[in-house]
Interface confidence: low
Amino acid sequence: WELTILHTNDVHSRLEQTSEDSSKCVNASRCMGGVARLFTKVQQIRRAEPNVLLLDAGDQYQGTIWFTVYKGAEVAHFMNALRYDAMALGNHEFDNGVEGLIEPLLKEAKFPILSANIKAKGPLASQISGLYLPYKVLPVGDEVVGIVGYTSKETPFLSNPGTNLVFEDEITALQPEVDKLKTLNVNKIIALGHSGFEMDKLIAQKVRGVDVVVGGHSNTFLYTGNPPSKEVPAGKYPFIVTSDDGRKVPVVQAYAFGKYLGYLKIEFDERGNVISSHGNPILLNSSIPEDPSIKADINKWRIKLDNYSTQELGKTIVYLDGSSQSCRFRECNMGNLICDAMINNNLRHTDEMFWNHVSMCILNGGGIRSPIDERNNGTITWENLAAVLPFGGTFDLVQLKGSTLKKAFEHSVHRYGQSTGEFLQVGGIHVVYDLSRKPGDRVVKLDVLCTKCRVPSYDPLKMDEVYKVILPNFLANGGDGFQMIKDELLRHDSGDQDINVVSTYISKMKVIYPAVEGRIKFS
């Protein structure tokens, strides 16, 4: 019996087609992805093949103005229109709190939403009961397939699930649910979830009875053969893991942002064992036309976005200096504003010992692309912020050793004075440079804000200590020459859309007046 699994993950609000790098579509003839194009391909496959499942492995939420405005209603509407068969909860589905998941998505979705390792307690338990499930048995042709869900247990540090949801260890939580499916005579089981490729492989290895793992969170691109675009494969598609009980378990992920549709064909024997698996992600490029009815629907929903982008989010009573003359040479107040917003967005008081789990932010000055003039009545709009942060990136959480941070700050000024983008703006960090010293030895003082303290204060950076830092995904991926971050990071979790972080902060503060306050000094 043959099953076709179509899968997406980490779509992050890319409902419209995007450019090749998943930013705003500039030249339509070269754009990719989007739900209208995805629907064309899915329908084509549904027409051609008998047993098809369309699955999503989480993180539909967060990433563009679509989510900012529609807050998840757009996800439910268009996933319903595409007739998804199941979805796993990702960490970003909790970005607007549990209410922001229940009302727009859980109550509106016409497909099961899954996670076996999230347990509700207290008053929430009855409120959320039945709205998401640990597993679901789906009829496919003449057979049944069990789908069991999972979500990153780091979600409390990455999003806003509140105090009434407990995120258990994935493997511990999955095993009893799979065992239950076996007792129900379900012998074809897919683990669908959002914990990253390393955990996907562990699940394939450790959870008895799981036949296929469809994952997300790490934006992993797998491909067999010559890759069709810029993404470099982390391994073959599917990635085969040998389980502890000797089975070959295919593991798949489909990069992110709706650029690809994962396409996996599995052949099962009559006892539900996987005999063979093969496939590849399908690049959703402009050779695949956008479905006209979905596209028309997108255009209808778009109108509200255009109105939103010119509305006032808040006010500034000072000039927000985002000029390259400032932000690439010295501390600039636009850099301070953005870093303060990044930290504010990551306030998670999850431990009495820590006032927060992260206190530091770094931001490449070259990523700040425009100032905002306070003389326009002080008004700040989404449109203004899109000029400051035009690349559609995310502000991510990483763990780094102090020694890596020191290297990053040396890199920040290694060719100072040429107006290059790697000059770092900061939050929760005090740095002093001596430019008379040779490159690689210019950081003379680097103090960082403590987290394990009731009164935050600045202490000297310790080379061997592991620190959490918020930074743009561009830096986490080694951009602007920060190869040491990419090579030495100990953990990397994708965060919220950059503009969304800053806009939320400005809306929350109402009036802002960031200053240049001595975070970066030259001796």
């Epitope: 000029s323 390259s324 400032s326 425009s370 100032p371 035009p390 107006s419 020459g481």
Partner: antibody, heavy 118, light 107 residues
Framework: QVQMKQSGPELVKPGASVKIPCKAS????????MDWVKQSHGESLEWIGD????????IYNQKFKGKVTLTIDKSSSTAYMELRSLTSEDTAVYYC???????????WGQGTSVTVSS | DIQMTQSPSSMYASLGERVTITCKAS??????LSWFQQKPGKSPKTLIY???RLIDGVPSRFSGSGSGQDYSLTISSLEYEDMGIYYC?????????FGGGTKLELK
């Protein structure tokens, strides 16, 4: 539509100065930086510098420091480039070019020819 | 300053031919590269920025690619109006620097 309008050709004597205007239209003047580029006859292009119309901030190519001053007049949406102490080496066509959100030049003026001759 | 080495410096091609011009930077320029076309007596016209993003209104036969230090401009099927001089420009680091140009003529 976006346009940069430059003035006509200039014939100037050695040692004199010249101020070339570049009038922008079709977009919000303060939203984009303005770059200036030199092209000597039959040669490639040379980047002179860049001005931010929001705050008048400038970045110059070291090679043109002391030779060139970039200014703006927000009220007329005009950028200016002044060339001082002119010599025959300064004979060239000078272009202004708007930069887009990526700081890449996208729209160019038609160029102003400056000839330095006694 | 970053050196931009463009090649070839001149070339002849036939109508309908696929043409590729390359530009090599003396260091990584993070895809901050533009391509321009200039015709005699005219100002340059921007074709591509950010290495591969087409400016609105530029025909789709023009495409850009590359990363790091190596970049190229391709014309998929040459037309008569494509004759002229092509320049690359890096805008990653000040001072911005142009390539020496490639003169494209009809064979």
């Amino acid at each position: 539509q976006v346009q940069m309008k430059q003035s006509g050709p200039e014939l100037v004597k050695p040692g004199a100065s010249v101020k070339i205007p570049c009038k922008a239209s079709g977009y919000t003047f303060t939203d984009s930086n303005m770059d200036w580029v030199k092209q000597s006859h039959g040669e490639s292009l040379e980047w002179i510098g860049d001005i931010n119309p929001n705050n008048g901030g400038t970045i110059y190519n070291q090679k043109f420091k002391g030779k060139v001053t970039l200014t703006i007049d927000k009220s007329s949406s005009t950028a200016y480039m002044e060339l001082r102490s002119l010599t025959s080496e300064d004979t060239a066509v000078y272009y202004c070019a708007r930069t887009n959100w990526d700081y890449a030049m996208d729209y160019w003026g038609q160029g102003t020819s400056v000839t330095v001759s006694s | 300053d970053i050196q931009m080495t463009q090649s070839p410096s001149s070339m002849y091609a036939s109508l309908g031919e696929r043409v590729t011009i390359t530009c090599k930077a003396s260091q990584d320029i993070n895809s901050n590269l533009s391509w321009f076309q200039q015709k005699p007596g005219k100002s340059p016209k921007t074709l591509i920025y950010r290495a591969n993003r087409l400016i609105d209104g530029v025909p789709s036969r023009f495409s850009g690619s590359g990363s790091g230090q190596d970049y190229s401009l391709t014309i998929s099927s040459l037309e008569y109006e494509d004759m002229g001089i092509y320049y690359c420009l890096q805008y990653d680091v000040f001072p911005r620097t142009f390539g020496g140009g490639t003169k494209l003529e009809l064979k």
